[in-house]
């Protein structure tokens, strides 16, 4: 592949004109030992509206893994099983934090960045414009 | 608001002790700006599996304020608009990375923490557990 | 205490399947991915995949794309790898590997599983 | 798919001695890369991650440094049990991919 060399302009992190910055310990601590574990269930098979998950990485932000959801189906899975086109799974989206490495390729020095991601599916009634 | 006075052990940005610390620029940048206007949508009404949005607000987090899901139901909305205790709604949960003030109450200083939210229910079959 | 414990030695004719299993104990099997590496008779090592237990999302290497599948079974904390249309260059120990996504390294390992294909 | 090469392939050491093995990635990896130790019939074990953080329980006397690039381990007095198979690895882009290891014999 195509060699990319690390970036000259990486800040120096005593740069005190390096704009609004702050310093970020990345041992991440982790709030959810202890939470209710159906968080970690089969949602995504069980739902009237399923997904699958998709692993998408981006080497240059942090965390650079995210798993996004899509949708299996336009429509919803009824009782019998069949999907009901009168309903429609949608996509629950939801605004995150990532860090992107700013200039790229810097080990140390990051922007914050708000990125969309797909977290999983939900079966909605459909908006129904009528025609005059 | 409260004054929090700034912790007289907050670290300098030149310390190289600081544990796996990196710089990040607070500016945000926003890649959601041309993405589908359809997230901010009436979904949480629409759905099957209807949910509320709740202000969870932490000072020493940042962000700062974060939107937590709580299903409405405990069952979901059938094609009557009933609540159909045969299905469960069930809250989609993301773990998502925040700034945590650390030490407390220091401007610039920050650890990274995962944290588990609520972002919307979906509507699941419930498990049966056939009792021989 | 984390450990892998995965599946004992197979010996398999070209063209058939084999399916390694990993089981996990000493944490919470849904909260981290697995990858699977392997390593033929003293060569280096080459990733064929992963899976995440707690959503079911997986992501392969293009090399085995075709021929590799990963599940995992919440119930038992154990994850699977299949691969299909063994030849005799599949011959390896194939390892599972606990992966650390905001850290970025395989902390845990399998003792390894020996596929030997051979007619 | 990013290459890893390293090198040398094989090296011959006494008890002592210090040892360096370098890792050239085929493009920028930053510094998502981490250094395993295998033994023979054993899995690998992670000594270094992010290039130069040493994993929990790793003698200081292993060492790693480097990013973009360039990467290089260090043994700085070599033990009797230090006597393996090293390898490099990247974390930085799937498919995640291994130097061709480096085996370090007594000499």
């Known amino acids: 592949g195509i060699t990319i060399p690390r970036n000259p302009g990486c800040p120096n992190s005593e740069d005190k004109n390096f704009p609004r910055t702050v310093m970020v310990n990345l041992n991440i601590h982790n709030r959810n030992t202890n939470t209710n574990p159906k968080r970690s269930s089969d949602y995504y098979n069980r739902s009237t509206s399923p997904w699958n998950l998709h692993r998408n990485e981006d080497p240059e932000r942090y965390p650079s893994v995210i798993w996004e959801a899509k949708c299996r189906h336009l429509g919803c899975i009824n009782a019998d099983g069949n999907v009901d086109y009168h309903m429609n799974s949608v996509p629950i989206q939801q605004e995150i934090l990532v860090l992107r490495r700013e200039p790229p390729h810097c080990p140390n020095s990051f922007r914050l960045e708000k990125i969309l991601v797909s977290v999983g599916c939900t079966c909605v009634t459909p908006i129904v414009h009528h025609v005059a | 608001g409260i004054t929090i006075p700034r912790n007289p052990g907050c670290p300098n940005s030149e310390d190289k002790n600081f544990p796996r610390t990196v710089m990040v620029n607070l500016n945000i940048h926003n890649r959601n700006t041309n993405t589908n206007p359809k997230r901010s949508s009436d979904y949480y009404n629409r759905s099957t599996s209807p949910w509320n949005l709740h202000r969870n607000e932490d000072p020493e987090r940042y962000p700062s304020v974060i939107w937590e899901a709580k299903c409405r139901h405990l069952g979901c909305i059938n094609a009557d608009g009933n609540v159909d205790y045969h299905m469960n709604s069930v809250p989609i949960q993301q773990e998502i990375l925040v700034l945590r003030r650390e030490p407390p109450h220091c401007p610039n200083s920050f650890r990274l923490e995962k944290i588990l939210v609520s972002v919307g229910c979906t509507c699941v079959t419930p498990i049966v557990h056939h009792v021989a | 205490e984390v450990q892998l414990v995965q599946s004992g030695a197979e010996v398999k004719k070209p063209g058939a399947s084999v399916k390694v299993s990993c089981k996990a104990s000493g944490y919470t099997f849904t909260d981290y991915e697995f990858h699977w590496v392997r390593q033929a008779p003293g060569q280096g090592l080459e990733w064929i995949g992963v899976i995440h237990p707690g959503n079911g999302g997986t992501a392969y290497n293009q090399n085995f794309r075709d021929r590799a599948t990963l599940t995992a079974d919440k119930s038992t904390s154990t994850a699977y790898m299949e691969l299909s249309s063994l030849r005799s260059e599949d011959t390896a120990v194939y390892y599972c590997?606990?992966?650390?996504?905001?850290?970025?390294?395989?902390?845990?390992w399998g003792q390894g599983t020996l596929v030997t294909v051979s007619s | 798919d990013i290459q890893m090469t390293q090198s040398p392939s094989s090296l011959s050491a006494s008890v002592g001695d210090r040892v360096t093995i370098t890792c050239k990635a085929s493009?920028?990896?930053?510094?998502?890369v981490g250094w395993y130790q295998q033994k023979p019939g054993k899995a690998p074990k992670l000594l270094i991650y992010?290039?130069?953080n040493r994993y929990t329980g790793v003698p200081s006397r292993f060492s790693g440094s480097g990013s973009g690039t360039d990467f290089t381990f260090t043994i700085s007095s070599l033990q009797p049990e230090d006597f393996a198979t090293y390898y490099c690895?990247?974390?930085?882009?799937?498919?995640?991919?291994f130097g061709q290891g480096t085996k370090l014999e007594i000499k």
């Open positions: 493009q920028s990896v930053s510094i998502d």
């Open positions: 590997t606990r992966f650390l996504t905001y850290e970025g390294y395989f902390d845990y």
């Open positions: 690895q990247q974390d930085y882009s799937s498919p995640y991919t």
């Open positions: 992010h290039a130069s």
